[in-house]
Amino acid sequence: CDLPQTHSLGNRRALILLAQMRRISPFSCLKDRHDFEFPQEEFDDKQFQKAQAISVLHEMIQQTFNLFSTKDSSAALDETLLDEFYIELDQQLNDLESCVMQEVGVIESPLMYEDSILAVRKYFQRITLYLTEKKYSSCAWEVVRAEIMRSFSLSINLQKRLKSKE
């Protein structure tokens, strides 16, 4: 499955929007940084099928969408930027869903890669728990924003590797 050229442009736009969402200086939040234990092994160049990689990417973007579409995120972040961000993520999800259909031919395919998807879900659960424990403070959101930018970058790298293997 060929992801459209607009997909990688959308990725870049999403990263830029995340960068623009910064509300405070990250240097005032150094003590709030946290290791969320990003499931790196799910994004490494292991010999998994392309369909599995697409499913993991889909889950990553879906969870990112969920995280940023809560009422707490709307209160903490710029709504105009958030709206643009949702549009980009929605497009990413559509592209990846089309790909999953082409690769596997069944919409339920993510169930075949439960362990990988569970690892991504647990990662986002840790992020949500951190935000809750920090009472959704501005520093907590800044730490999470940086974390999502980092994980999003790793997702983009995986997509690039998939493309180069075609």
């Epitope: 870049r12 830029i16 623009q20 150094l30 003590k31 946290h34 290791d35 730490v143």
Partner: antibody, heavy 120, light 111 residues
Framework: QVQLQESGTVLARPGASVKMSCKAS????????MHWVKQRPGQGLEWIGV????????TYNQKFKDKAKLTAVTSANTAYMELSSLTNEDSAVYFC?????????????WGQGTTVTVSS | DIVLTQSPASLAVSLGQRATISCRAS??????????MHWYQQKPGQTPKLLIY???NLESGVPARFSGSGSGTDFTLNIHPVEEEDAATYYC?????????FGSGTKLEIK
């Protein structure tokens, strides 16, 4: 590919000011913090401060707060550092360097350095 | 400011042997699972090059003979087996709090 091109060698008098530049290419200049680092001849490295070109936010090492001023012009993809009230202690090589890994604050790409010599 | 003390100031290691460089921080640079200590290599007349980030993560493109370890205040850079091209000065850098500081450097010579 990512490149940081710094301005050439500068010779200045004590008490004067100098402004050096760092032109970035090969990446999104506005979305990466840019650090500045000082290295005196035969000595170690000192962190001066950092600027976010996207909106001009700066954070300084207190030691350099009254010495260095960081700015950026996004239309030119260029970061600048101005050093004022120069003394012999300011004679050094100054590097601009791109922030890496977001809030880990490491530095991946470095400019070739601008040599500043302060002499009367 | 957090002071980073590197030792030794210089060392000479035979080709193929192990080089061990230590960096001690005057205060912990670890928090919530991450150790904010990084290592750079600087060859004469060149700019520093990132080798290791967050104490033990190998930067992309850096040979696997480089490894980092440690947490809290004590960190180590190991090079094994040492190769000719590893002759350089090595610096640790922390980003645990402001201001970020570097160690004074360790000069590695290959025998």
């Amino acid at each position: 590919q990512v490149q940081l091109q710094e301005s050439g060698t500068v010779l200045a008098r004590p008490g004067a000011s100098v402004k050096m530049s760092c032109k970035a290419s090969g990446y999104s200049f506005t979305t990466y913090w840019m650090h500045w680092v000082k290295q005196r001849p035969g000595q170690g490295l000192e962190w001066i401060g950092v600027i976010y070109p996207g909106n001009g936010d700066t954070t300084y090492n207190q030691k350099f707060k009254d010495k260095a001023k960081l700015t950026a012009v996004t239309s030119a993809n260029t970061a600048y550092m101005e050093l004022s009230s120069l003394t012999n202690e300011d004679s050094a090589v100054y590097f601009c360097t791109r922030n890496y890994k977001y809030d880990y604050y490491t530095m991946d790409y470095w400019g070739q350095g601008t040599t500043v010599t302060v002499s009367s | 400011d957090i002071v980073l003390t590197q030792s030794p100031a210089s060392l000479a290691v035979s080709l193929g042997q192990r080089a061990t460089i230590s960096c001690r921080a005057s205060k912990s640079v670890s928090t919530s699972g991450h150790s904010y200590m990084h290592w750079y290599q600087q060859k004469p007349g060149q700019t520093p090059k990132l080798l290791i980030y967050l104490a033990s993560n190998l930067e992309s493109g850096v040979p696997a003979r480089f490894s980092g370890s440690g947490s809290g205040t004590d960190f180590t850079l190991n090079i094994h087996p040492v190769e000719e091209e590893d002759a350089a000065t090595y610096y640790c850098q922390h980003s645990g709090e402001l201001p970020f500081t570097f160690g004074s450097g360790t000069k590695l010579e290959i025998k």
